[in-house]
């Protein structure tokens, strides 16, 4: 059963007002809807012990010699900050104790590409998707997820690191993204706005959205997340909207209600297991697909993105606690977590359906610009 | 035999404190997660709080209604669980029940074990 | 907070006789359901888990069924002993909560 939360088929951009033009001009970002240039990246940071690698938190190595094959903090290396800076973008900051830990935020120095210089690199998420300009591959199969239905027991790590919440996941949930593409489910995490101002980090035709979700995911290829980085298809993000609707999503109301336990920064507590599926669009057929970058340092590229094209709907209460319950550093609100939209330079974005054909209501005439990359993959 | 003992009930007056503790015995106290559950008078069950075992590092978890009065905790060098309820009102007047709960090899709260209960009367 | 509703509230029924009884969940619980027995001055005892999982010494008599938010309680063939009350208790989620409990009488 899936509680009736999604919107059921309205392309990507459509509220549950069902208007026509749900992209229109009032939807477009004024300048406070997209963080400027020093309204940086993304928030995955490189957290406490614990914690499990992922576009989040991207612990530092330990030796290898410690469980060599179980995915721990130590799964991702140290970000180094390079002396030179470079374009002051996306700005992080470091701790005052000068840890190795690059401890950064979004506004404020230095320039990401300083605490990573891969922040610097071509290929960077988030990014603006224009269906019209998708490549549409009818090769992208519809989504494989396995065991993401899980027990209340054992429960699970939710944990405030002072750029998102993030949920720890446990062994044992796959994802495919097609024949001879899986993966395995690491953590999730949530990007919002403040009151009033949309937070998503993709944007589609320019319209932010209030929230998204990230769902990161290792390659069964790789042992750890450390040799996974930067390497094409190493890691994998599902990214769904977060829309407002008329009704309270049980699903997420399991997370939202334990915010305020975790308020202050760096605070964690526990939560039972729960349907992680049911906190994603329940169609699985329809998204977009690039390569990318994690949108926190360390920015590492060959990212895979699926981004889907329904989006999940949350009351207005549970939007408003999202995004006003949780602290930051230096006793801010944890608010506007999300990284500018970057270049595309040259990529194509590849939809799994024809989007460009008849989902997108603002066309006066398809374009289908692209062809599909994917195909024969 | 794997049981549940529970002592510390009485009659107290609103306002008042009183702690109830809980006895072990017959399994491995330490791996389990130990929750109360209290039963008004002609009333059905309601779950009152549980602490999590030494592996999920001894934390609590409270129903709304208790929650800021009372304070579960644990000895495990002892076998024994405790429930210290503060600022009492008339509605926490109920039998309570010292319960087992879910472990490491399990993977779904339920409650398979109840001790016999104790009773807590709160009146003027 | 995760409502449970049993019913019926009363029933009543003849030695031998197969009932059943309902819980209806407010939200999707998947099969995190428990039943338990409580007979007058005792504490309560777990009957099934996991929706249909008979507990360890519970007679055959009784079987649990259902998932998401329909469950049910049957008792095969009443025993004088089973003329007590029953509750059902959702495990998905915290506040654990009870169904307000179903009385079985002798007709």
């Known amino acids: 059963q899936r509680l009736p939360r999604m919107q059921e088929d309205s392309p990507l951009g459509g509220g549950s007002s069902g208007e026509d033009d749900p992209l229109g001009e009032e939807d477009l970002p004024s300048e406070e809807d997209s963080p400027r240039e020093e309204d940086p990246p993304g928030e995955e940071d490189l957290p406490g012990e614990e914690d499990l690698p992922g576009e989040e938190d991207l612990p530092e190595v330990k030796p290898k010699s410690e469980e060599e094959g179980s995915l721990k903090l130590e799964d991702l290396p140290t970000v180094e900050a390079p002396g030179d800076p470079q374009e002051p973008q996306n700005n992080a900051h470091r701790d005052k104790e000068g840890d190795d830990q690059s401890h950064w935020r979004y506004g404020g120095d230095p320039p990401w590409p300083r605490v990573s210089p891969a922040c610097a690199g071509r290929f960077q998420s988030p990014v603006d998707i224009r269906p019209q300009l998708a490549a549409f591959c009818p090769a992208l199969r519809p989504l494989e997820l396995l065991g993401f239905q899980l027990p209340p027991l054992p429960e699970l790590r939710l944990r405030n690191n002072g750029h998102s919440v993030q949920l720890t996941l446990p062994p044992g949930l796959e994802m495919a993204l097609g024949p001879g593409r899986e993966y395995r489910a690491l953590q999730l995490h949530l990007h919002w706005g403040a009151a009033g101002r949309p937070g998503s980090e993709h944007t589609v035709e320019g319209h932010r959205f209030p929230a998204e979700i990230h769902v990161v995911h290792l390659s069964t290829a790789f042992a750890r997340v450390d040799e996974a980085l930067g390497r094409p298809g190493g890691l994998a993000v599902l990214a769904a909207f977060l829309e407002e609707g008329p009704e309270e999503n049980s699903a997420y109301e399991q997370l939202l209600s334990r915010l305020e336990e975790i308020a202050e920064e760096g605070s964690e507590t526990q939560v039972p297991g729960l349907d992680i599926s049911a906190l994603l669009p329940s169609d699985f057929s329809r998204y977009f697909q690039y390569e990318g970058s994690l949108t926190t340092p360390p920015c590492a590229q060959g990212v895979i993105w699926t981004v889907f094209n329904q989006t999940v709907m949350l009351s207005a209460k549970q939007l408003h606690t999202l995004s006003d319950t949780l602290w930051g550093p230096g006793d801010s609100r944890l608010q506007l977590n999300f990284r500018a939209t970057q270049p595309l330079n040259g990529r194509v974005i590849e939809a799994s359906f024809p989007a460009g054909v008849d989902s997108s209501p603002r066309a006066a005439e398809p374009v289908q610009l692209n062809s599909c990359l994917a195909a024969g993959d | 035999e794997v049981q549940l003992v529970e002592s510390g009930g009485g009659l107290v007056q609103p306002g008042g404190s009183l702690r109830l503790s809980c006895a072990a015995s017959?399994?491995?106290?330490?791996?389990?997660?130990m929750h109360w559950v209290r039963q008004a008078p002609g009333k059905g069950l309601e779950w009152v709080a549980f602490?999590?075992?030494?592996?999920?590092?001894?934390?609590?978890q409270y129903s709304a209604s208790v929650k800021g009065r009372f304070t579960i905790s644990r000895d495990d060098s002892k076998n024994s669980l405790y429930l210290q309820m503060n600022s009492l009102k008339i509605e926490d007047t109920a039998v309570y029940y010292c319960?087992?709960?879910?472990?490491?090899?399990?993977?779904?709260?339920?409650?398979?074990?109840w001790g016999q209960g104790t009773t807590v009367t709160v009146s003027s | 907070d995760i409502q449970m509703t049993q019913s019926p509230s009363t029933l009543s029924a003849s030695v031998g006789d197969r009932v059943t009884i309902t819980c209806h969940v407010s939200?999707?619980?998947?099969?995190?359901l428990s039943w338990y027995q409580q007979k007058p001055g005792n504490a309560p005892k777990l009957l099934i888990y996991?929706?249909?999982n008979l507990h360890t010494g519970v007679p055959s008599r009784f079987s649990g069924s259902g998932s998401g938010t329909e469950f049910t309680l049957t008792i095969g063939s009443l025993q004088p002993d089973d003329f007590v009350t029953y509750y059902c208790?959702?495990?998905?989620?915290?506040?654990?909560?009870f169904g307000q409990g179903t009385k079985v009488e002798i007709k």
């Open positions: 996991q929706a249909s």
């Open positions: 017959g399994f491995t106290f330490t791996d389990y997660y």
């Open positions: 602490i999590r075992n030494k592996a999920s590092g001894y934390t609590p």
């Open positions: 319960v087992r709960g879910g472990h490491a090899g399990s993977n779904y709260w339920y409650f398979d074990v």
């Open positions: 208790q959702q495990g998905q989620s915290y506040p654990f909560t």
């Open positions: 939200q999707n619980i998947n099969v995190w």
